[in-house]
């Protein structure tokens, strides 16, 4: 069956670059000050190709001595970006990714931004703020999410194959109606996973099968009318 027989079911996506942030506005800073400092580490899923802004603890910049961002990415030496208020100087060590920058001048805004998040940005990000009252830090386990490419086709009579290619994390595939299914996962070196579900329907009154792919980036469904059983000419329903 040719590819043009596939019916894609998904909401139209907005391809403008989205931006995500866990930063809080000034009102929240005073309300949640102690709570935020207690929540030192945050797991944060971020969709690939979006912009991300990571925040330091909500400490007034006037109380600051040094801000340091420590960035630990897989397979790379630890990168640090530091700002010393007294001398108004910034220093970088082992930082090669030009997409990871201060949001603006660090004396005005201590936040870190990642422009156009890539799989390579998976890792741990920590802001350490040195003040006269002690050191405060906030860490992020950044999990980059990759939307899988979804395809559906028939490879044999009354057998359909649904693939969620190169998703991160692995997608989950379900079917309507349920069939006799086998699912395989293929892991790629970049951290993405391809999930392949092959199903067979023996019941002859099944006309159309729907593959539903669930993923943290959103859900997609595809459907296809099954080919007839070879040799079957007529049936009453």
């Amino acid at each position: 069956q040719p590819n043009n027989s596939l019916m894609l079911q998904t909401s139209k996506e907005n391809h403008a670059l989205a931006s995500s942030s866990l930063c809080m506005d000034e009102k929240q800073i005073t309300q949640n000050y102690s709570k935020v400092l207690a929540e030192v580490n945050t797991s944060w899923p971020v969709k690939m190709a979006t912009n991300a802004v990571l925040c330091c603890p909500p400490i007034a910049l006037r109380n600051l001595i040094i801000i340091t961002w420590e960035i630990i990415l897989r397979g790379q030496p630890s990168c640090t970006k530091a700002y010393k208020k007294e001398t108004n100087e910034t220093k970088e060590t082992n930082c090669t990714d030009e997409r990871i920058t201060w949001v603006s001048r660090p004396d005005q805004n201590s936040d870190l931004q990642i422009r156009t998040v890539a799989i390579t940005h998976d890792g741990y990000y920590r802001c350490i703020m040195v003040t006269p009252d002690g050191n405060f830090h906030r860490g992020y386990h950044l999990q980059v999410l990759v939307t899988p490419e979804v395809t559906l086709f028939q490879n044999r009579n009354r057998t359909a194959v649904c693939k969620a290619v190169a998703g991160k994390p692995a997608a989950h595939i379900s079917w309507i109606p349920e069939g006799d299914c086998a699912t395989k996962q293929e892991y790629w070196s970049n951290g993405t996973v391809t999930v392949k579900s092959t199903c067979h329907w023996e019941v002859h009154n099944v006309s159309t099968v729907t593959c539903h792919v669930s993923h943290l980036t959103g859900n997609k469904s595809l459907y296809i009318e099954l080919l007839p059983v070879p040799g079957a000419k007529k049936s009453a329903k």
């Epitope: 309507i176 469904s221 459907y223 009318e225 000419k233």
Partner: antibody, heavy 114, light 107 residues
């Protein structure tokens, strides 16, 4: 863009037969099921059956079993629906549809009247 | 056969109203479906395919949701041109079956 062009309106006597045609273009004719649906005046929609032109495989709804015949001519990309032993309650608009029900013809009015 | 129970069968509406139509598949059997709009003398027009996918050129005030056996079709703010009859169609099992239709009438 898939296009389904149906034959014109028909007036038939009770007991007669009618054959409605539906010519498809814009897609691979032999790769998609073609369905027939009818609608009596002021009534809802009723599925009659389907045919797979690539193999001639057919499914008929039990209600029409023995009275309906669906065929396909792959040389002209045309499907046919023939309904025999017509009665007044077969007066309806008959639609062909394909691409899992997403493309419809404009319909053919069949009037059965003595 | 799968029966599609569509409700309500008719609805008196005003321009600007939010309209909700439901379809439920019998026997607790999960299915997939389309939603159609039909105006007098015209063929049904596909609005929502596969339960929730808005067809190209269809205004965004139309939406579909649901999965399994229970589905909902919504018009967020009714316009005069939306006065029509609406049908659901399950296409998972043969025979394909339609809901009995919901006719919208102006109050």
């Amino acid at each position: 863009q898939v296009q389904l062009v149906q034959s014109g309106a028909e007036v038939k006597k009770p007991g007669a037969s009618v054959k409605v045609s539906c010519k498809a273009s814009g897609h691979t004719f032999t790769s998609y099921w073609m369905h027939w649906v009818r609608q009596a005046p002021g009534q809802g929609l009723e599925w009659m059956g389907n045919i797979y032109p690539g193999s001639g495989s057919i499914n008929y709804d039990e209600k029409f079993q023995g009275r309906v015949t669906m065929t396909a001519d792959t040389s002209t990309s045309t499907v046919y629906m023939e309904l025999s032993s017509l009665r007044s309650e077969d007066t309806a608009v008959y639609y062909c549809l394909t691409m899992t029900g997403t493309s419809w013809g404009r319909g053919t009015l069949v009037t059965v009247s003595s | 056969d799968i029966q599609m129970t569509q409700s309500p069968s008719s609805l008196s509406v005003s321009v600007g109203d939010r309209v909700t139509i439901t379809c439920q598949a019998s026997q607790g059997t999960p299915i997939n479906l389309h939603w159609f709009q039909q105006k007098p003398g015209k063929a049904p027009k596909l609005l929502i395919s596969g339960a929730s996918n808005l067809e190209d050129g269809v205004p965004s005030r139309f939406s579909g949701s649901g999965s399994g056996t229970d589905f909902t079709f919504t018009i967020s703010s009714l316009q005069p041109e939306d006065i029509a009859t609406y049908y659901c169609l399950q296409f998972t099992y043969i025979p394909w079956t339609f809901g009995q239709g919901t006719k919208l009438e102006i109050k």
